[in-house]
Interface confidence: low
């Protein structure tokens, strides 16, 4: 089964005359009749054994014929056949003039024929068009033709039936010769057998569709090559289905008993050492300064009140430190200070006794400083100017000459970064090479000192006798700096009346 297709392309009848030589009035309104028949050595009249077809009026005198296959199938002309194509044919094409609208043969005058051509030959099935041109004395016809198979017919003679399908009975398309070509993922004579996912385990997996890998009971994974462990197996694996071989550190039938609590839960805090001591049992060995089951509690060495004579205790990483009140010194503020009799003032400093000789003060000459006038005032020795600033001594004071781009008393501010005062709550802004840094006042933290971090222990004014109060941020406690004449952790005792401590 197939179709002989004839594509009319151009008809030339410049003088607009009939085959008899008589002119058409007003012009030759031309249509065509086509007859397809079996091969004849000399094409003669008789039945059109392979089929016949007529066109409507396609033009007047000379015209090109539009390809109209999309608009109803008029050109190319279709001559279907439902037998094996023999490979040879005869073709007769007649051009007729239609004086009126009735194109039936009996309705036309016998001399309405414009031209008639007849060809014969061999023609193989194929997609390529054969182009031909036939010329008579007065007319010329250009056309092309071919034979193609109908849907589902294949082979050299359109005799092989093959219908593509994609269902339970097969998954294939048809090759040009009519043989089956399996769709991707299918195999077998009729392409009914799915090709499983590449690598799907032969014994443990199977498939009902291509690229699928369905697992048999006891197996899992994309390729069904992983066994399923025993139901309830928590921390274990298997090499065959339903096993439960415990991972390191786990035990029990379902591998749910924790034999390595230290590794799995890291319960010990603050750098303590963890030791497993049985199922879900462990012991923490604390670093100095920590206590508790998990070493979660910080020991405070100030708890034993080691500072004497009203000294204030401050916890430090490596122990503690006593802040002694005026008149006392030593690790625990256990020593009283020198008196003027000891000539403590250097560099010509004058000694003045205080509090009935209990302590003293040095009045230093110009250019010397320190509690004993032991330091020369060279305000530039400590390189106070940041960011390459130049330090200049100006008598009793100093000044910093800053490099371009920096400002502030110590050239510590980068003009561009710190100019917009980014540090909150009175934080000090420092310019760095790639940004800025805020040094926050007590009680605040964060990149811009925006986070309030502690309670101000000095807020309740705990120091007496006009002492200066300082907040110790590490412990949220306060330290009182006593004026002359007062001692005690709150400067509450006059020097003349020392407190009675129980030691």
């Amino acid at each position: 089964s197939g179709v002989f297709q004839l594509q009319l392309q151009e008809f030339i009848n410049e003088r607009g005359v009939l085959a008899s030589g008589r002119p058409c009035e007003p012009g030759c309104r031309t249509f065509f009749r086509v007859c397809l028949k079996h091969f004849q050595a000399v094409v003669s009249p008789g039945p059109c054994t392979f089929g016949t077809v007529s066109t409507p009026v396609l033009g007047t005198n000379s015209f090109a014929v539009r390809d109209d296959s999309s608009g109803g199938g008029r050109n190319p002309l279709q001559l279907p056949f439902n037998f094996t194509w023999p490979g040879t044919f005869s073709l007769i094409i007649e051009a007729w003039h239609a004086p009126g609208d009735d194109l039936r043969p009996e309705a036309l005058p016998p001399d309405a024929l414009i031209s008639k051509i007849a060809i014969q030959g061999s023609l193989a099935v194929g997609q390529n068009w054969l182009l031909d041109e036939q010329t008579s004395t007065l007319t010329r016809l250009r056309y092309s033709y071919r034979v193609i198979c109908s849907d589902n017919y294949y082979g050299d003679n359109c005799s092989r039936l093959c219908k593509k399908r994609n269902d339970h009975f097969g998954h294939y398309v048809c090759q040009p010769d009519g043989n089956l070509s399996c769709l991707p993922g299918w195999t077998g004579e009729y392409c009914q057998q799915p090709i499983c996912l590449s690598g799907c385990h032969e014994q443990n997996g199977y498939c009902s569709k291509p690229a699928e890998c369905l697992c048999r009971p006891g197996w899992q994974g994309r390729l069904c090559n992983e066994c399923i462990p025993h139901n309830g197996c928590r921390h274990g694996t298997c090499s065959t289905p339903w096993q439960c071989t415990c991972d390191e550190g786990w035990g029990g039938l379902f591998c749910d008993q924790d034999l390595n609590y230290c590794t799995h839960h890291s319960p010990c805090k603050n750098g303590a050492t963890c030791s497993n001591s049985g199922q879900r049992s462990y012991t923490c060995t604390c670093r100095p300064g920590y206590t508790g089951v998990d070493c979660e509690l910080e020991l405070s060495e100030c708890d034993s009140n080691p500072c004497r004579n009203g000294g204030s205790c401050k916890d430090q990483e490596d122990g503690y430190h006593c802040l002694c009140p005026p008149g006392y010194y030593g690790l625990h503020c256990e020593h009283s200070t020198l008196s003027c009799a000891d000539s403590p003032c250097f560099n010509g400093g004058s000694c003045r006794e205080r509090n009935q000789g209990a302590n003293y003060a040095c009045e230093c000459p110009p250019n010397f400083t320190g509690s004993n006038c032991e330091k020369k005032v060279d305000r530039c020795t400590s390189n106070p100017c940041a960011n390459g600033g130049q330090c200049l001594n100006r008598g009793p004071s100093r000044m910093c000459r800053c490099r371009p781009g920096f400002t502030g008393t110590y050239c510590e501010l980068h003009v561009s970064d710190c100019a917009r005062n980014p540090c909150a709550h009175g934080g000090t802004c420092h310019d760095l090479e790639n940004g800025l840094m805020c040094t926050c006042p007590a009680g605040f933290s964060g990149r811009r000192c925006e986070v309030r971090t502690s309670i101000d222990a000095c807020a309740s004014s705990p120091c007496f006798n006009r002492a200066t109060c300082y907040t110790d941020l590490s412990t949220d406690t306060f330290v009182c700096n006593c004026p002359y004449g007062f001692v005690g952790s709150r400067c509450e005792f006059p020097v003349g009346l020392p407190p009675s401590f129980p030691w």
Partner: antibody, heavy 126, light 113 residues
């Protein structure tokens, strides 16, 4: 019982992108045994399949009409799947669901979309 | 590509038996080539798997729900209809054309009168 919990509702402007998450409760081993499919449902419409990912090996498959705009991924360490849709249009307004898929199947008792997330409403409006 | 067509609505009275059909058309029009899945969606909730592989019921789904297929159509039957069965029902199937994708039917709104 495994549950799928999705991220909250989103309101986006046309041309923007949205990323919806879908977290599976249960163990890592459970999560990687399955695929996650994403389905959306416009108001008053039926469900539309968007795409699928295997949590086992990361293989993906997308609906042809969305494949230039959608990406699905998984993070097996958190048992979470993600769906990102780019170049949003007003007709992308829908409830987006994740569902557990049968691929790879272990064993053959589990089936397509047997567990669904609660859905995430995505509204695209200028 | 395949298209799954469902009737937009169906109805029945309590105790009655109701059937919802799902027709396949397109490049893979023989629905028998693929497994059909049915989902129930109650208002404001996610769909719920009702039937898988044409006629299999997940645990927890009452045996009042059953599925079948023949040729180009599949059916969901609900016997002993109850008021709580009022919902949208969707069929779905995996279509192997192109690179493979899931196709959902347009849904059937079941009303219990």
């Amino acid at each position: 019982q495994v549950q799928l919990v999705q991220s909250g509702a989103e309101v986006k402007k046309p041309g923007a992108s949205v990323k919806v998450s879908c977290k599976a409760s249960g163990t890592y081993r459970t999560f990687t045994n399955y695929g996650i499919t994403w389905v959306r449902q416009a108001p008053g419409q039926g469900p539309e399949w968007m795409g699928w990912i295997s949590a086992y090996n990361g293989n993906t498959n997308y609906a042809q009409k969305l494949q230039d705009r959608v990406t699905v991924t998984t993070d097996t360490s958190t048992s979470t799947a993600y769906m990102e849709l780019r170049s949003l249009r007003s007709d992308d307004t829908a409830v987006y669901y994740c569902a557990r898929d049968r691929v790879p199947r272990i064993p053959v008792t589990t089936e397509a979309f047997d567990i669904w997330g609660q859905g995430t409403m995505v509204t695209v409006s200028s | 590509q395949s298209v799954l067509t469902q009737p937009p609505s169906a109805s029945g009275t309590p105790g009655q038996r109701v059937t919802i059909s799902c027709y396949s058309s397109g490049s893979s029009s023989n629905i028998g080539s693929y497994f059909v899945y049915w989902y129930q969606q109650l208002p404001g909730t996610a769909p719920k798997l009702l039937i898988y592989r044409n006629n299999q019921r997940p645990s927890g789904v009452p045996d009042r729900f059953s599925g079948s297929e023949s040729g180009t159509s599949a059916s969901l039957a609900i016997s002993g209809l109850r008021s709580e069965d009022e919902a949208d029902y969707y069929c779905a199937a995996w279509d192997d054309s192109l690179s493979g994708h899931w196709v959902f039917g347009g849904g059937t709104k079941l009303t219990v009168l």
